[in-house]
Amino acid sequence: CKAMHVAQPAVVLASSRGIASFVCEYASPGKATEVRVTVLRQADSQVTEVCAATYMMGNELTFLDDSICTGTSSGNQVNLTIQGLRAMDTGLYICKVELMYPPPYYLGIGNGTQIYVIDPEPCPDSDF
């Protein structure tokens, strides 16, 4: 396993609809054709997998149908979107990138993006 640099923003604020987007960029050390991207959430020293996708260079990023993540790839950067977020989902979201093929295998883990989610206030009842 060889190490690889990964960069991502330090902080992102989710929209009022519970959607957060951020870029994950990696320093590809060679001609990788198969890349796996995983989003991990760290909160209270617990790390859980949020979503993962494997893609071939030049093709779209495909997450499972029931995934809360969507994304697009362009060169050695991935634009990730996580939806359905609630205030309780606030935490550090870490981008993990693996160059699966061809060998050698490379692994890179970003420092994480702190995503803040604020639940919207319910609208007050209107007299109209």
């Epitope: 990696y26 260079m57 060169g75 950067q77």
Partner: nanobody
Framework: EVQLVESGGGLVQPGGSLRLSCAAS????????VGWFRQAPGKEREELSC????????DYPGSVKGRFTISRDNAKNTVYLQMNSLRAEDTAVYYC???????????????????WGQGTQVTVSS
Amino acid sequence: EVQLVESGGGLVQPGGSLRLSCAASGDTLESFAVGWFRQAPGKEREELSCIGRTGEFTDYPGSVKGRFTISRDNAKNTVYLQMNSLRAEDTAVYYCAAERLVFHLCSLSEYDYDTWGQGTQVTVSS
């Protein structure tokens, strides 16, 4: 859209040095990571080095580490490749390529670059 033009190639004796330049027009190069590649006749394109947008991150494959140095001057919209201790096997057409990125990293994979220069010929011979 950014356009790239390489210069600085030519004929050099073994053991000599050259500095290649990659000048950009049409856009500011500071928004782009830049890589240098070369292709010798009948061979695949080979990665040589890359540099991130700010210049703080660079990368080299083992084959040229210690002999080649990449740098950039964003004020001049130019990236440079300093090549020392040149050998006959360094003879090739040298290309620079650019990729618009958000952060400071760069890639050594030719697959990641979407804008390429026309190349400059480097010949190492006595």
